[in-house]
């Protein structure tokens, strides 16, 4: 049994880091493998993660962590029984993938303005809470070409757009994702999408 593709890990910088790797053949990850992880600091405890299958030869492990800070550095040991298959390290702050924003809502009752709001996925005491910026994706269910991205570079989890920038009388969907420049993170996954019917009063034509 050998590791074909070494584990790579990403952290949500809150409580979970996810490591994925591939074996050289079909493997029952949960029965054959264990991923041990431990902070490099004095007296830290070693923890065991039981991996799950992720495709035939792929494995994924969700490492539980508390109160992640930039100094944290973990040793990782991948074991198959008594055999050490791979040894490495992982610094969560250098491999951050933020949590996806939630509760995306489209408020359509504000004159001819669409107000999109969502929730910051982090609690206020987490470092990322005040460092997230967002991308909002809006697309038409009827017209695949009607697809747009709005970059929200301010901290407030909301976006206002004129309803007239979208076509009237058709349904649209929106979703939002986040990233943090401070840790050069990857983008989060997209939030679940929300749907609304776009309609607004056309201004009277002037003759």
């Amino acid at each position: 049994m050998k590791v074909l593709q070494e584990p790579t890990c990403v952290s949500d910088y809150m409580s979970i880091s996810t490591c994925e790797w591939k074996m050289n053949g079909p493997t029952n990850c949960s029965t054959e493998l264990r991923l041990l992880y431990q902070l490099v600091f004095l007296l830290s405890e070693a923890h065991t993660c039981i991996p799950e299958n992720n495709g035939g030869a792929g494995c994924v492990c969700h490492l539980l962590m508390d109160d992640v800070v930039s100094a944290d550095n973990y040793t990782l040991d991948l074991w198959a029984g008594q055999q050490l298959l791979w040894k490495g390290s992982f610094k969560p702050s250098e491999h951050v993938k933020p949590r996806a924003p939630g509760n995306l809502t489209v408020h359509t009752n504000v004159s001819d303005t669409l107000l999109l709001t969502w929730s910051n996925p982090y609690p206020p005491d987490n470092y990322l809470y005040n460092h997230l910026t967002y991308a909002v994706n809006i697309w038409s269910e009827n017209d695949p070409a009607d697809f747009r991205i709005y970059n929200v570079t301010y901290l407030e989890p909301s976006l206002r757009i004129a309803a007239s920038t979208l076509k009237s009388g058709i349904s649209y969907r929106a979703r939002v994702r986040a990233w943090a420049q401070c840790y050069n993170t990857t983008w989060s996954e997209w939030s679940p999408s929300t749907k609304w019917h776009n309609s607004y009063r056309e201004p009277f034509e002037q003759h």
């Epitope: 902070l39 490099v40 600091f41 007296l43 100094a71």
Partner: antibody, heavy 120, light 107 residues
Framework: EVQLVESGGGLVQPGGSLRLSCAAS????????MSWVRQAPGKRLELVAA????????YYADSVKGRFTISRDNSKNTLYLQMSSLRAEDTAVYYC?????????????WGQGTSVTVSS | DIQMTQSPSSLSASVGDRVTITCQAS??????LAWYQQKPGKAPKLLIY???NLETGVPSRFSGSGSGTDFTFTISSLQPEDIATYYC?????????FGGGTKLEIK
């Protein structure tokens, strides 16, 4: 309100023993890593000993290894430092501290300190 | 052991001044560094952990930065109650070690 109250300090002759105690309240003692830090006159702060939450793992500074023993009683919310074969260089104010995380790192709560003087 | 060199060892500043203290580690300590404030006759108090994280309840005029071997502690606008000795503390290497302290006085 978090409180760490040390007791047991005093004057002791070289070669003698002392047992320091630290009564903790205001936080979940049984899940906290704890430690003892000392501050000798004109010397740097020094982490003397540390212990994990269940008492199963300990750390000692080289200067006290084999002479000091850190322990805890989670049912009494109390941390201890048994000091034996005391030397003049052990003279210091001893602080009971709580580790901020589940490892030896930054210390977020400190007691008021108890003074230990080793002298003949 | 990792040596922590703090500078200056003492400094005098006026109320409202921006005050900067530096701490240099003899080898890489990542961002495993804390800053403490100790007032005369009192126990040290944690201000900053993990090099730049402000401890809960600590005024925002205190800040920390740096990684590796070079660290900075800053008071953006000195207040009379900030008169104290400040210590850095690395906990990346074993044993954990402290700086010699910086005594801050008011002009």
């Amino acid at each position: 309100e978090v409180q760490l109250v040390e007791s047991g300090g005093g004057l002791v002759q070289p070669g003698g023993s002392l047992r320091l105690s630290c009564a903790a309240s205001g936080f979940t003692f049984s899940s906290s890593y704890m430690s003892w830090v000392r501050q000798a006159p004109g010397k740097r702060l020094e982490l003397v000993a540390a212990i994990n939450s269940n008492g199963g793992k300990t750390y000692y500074a080289d200067s006290v290894k084999g002479r000091f023993t850190i322990s805890r009683d989670n049912s009494k919310n109390t941390l201890y430092l048994q000091m034996s074969s005391l030397r003049a260089e052990d003279t210091a104010v001893y602080y009971c501290t709580r580790q901020r995380g589940n490892y030896v790192g930054a210390m977020d709560y400190w007691g008021q300190g108890t003074s230990v003087t080793v002298s003949s | 052991d990792i040596q922590m060199t703090q500078s200056p060892s003492s400094l005098s500043a006026s109320v409202g001044d921006r005050v900067t203290i530096t701490c240099q580690a003899s080898q890489d300590v990542s961002t495993a560094l804390a800053w403490y404030q100790q007032k005369p006759g009192k126990a040290p108090k944690l201000l900053i952990y993990s090099a730049s994280n402000l401890e809960t309840g600590v005024p925002s005029r205190f800040s920390g930065s740096g990684s590796g071997t070079d660290f900075t502690f800053t008071i953006s606008s000195l207040q009379p109650e900030d008169i104290a000795t400040y210590y850095c503390h690395q906990y990346y290497g074993s044993p954990p070690t402290f700086g010699g302290g910086t005594k801050l006085e008011i002009k």
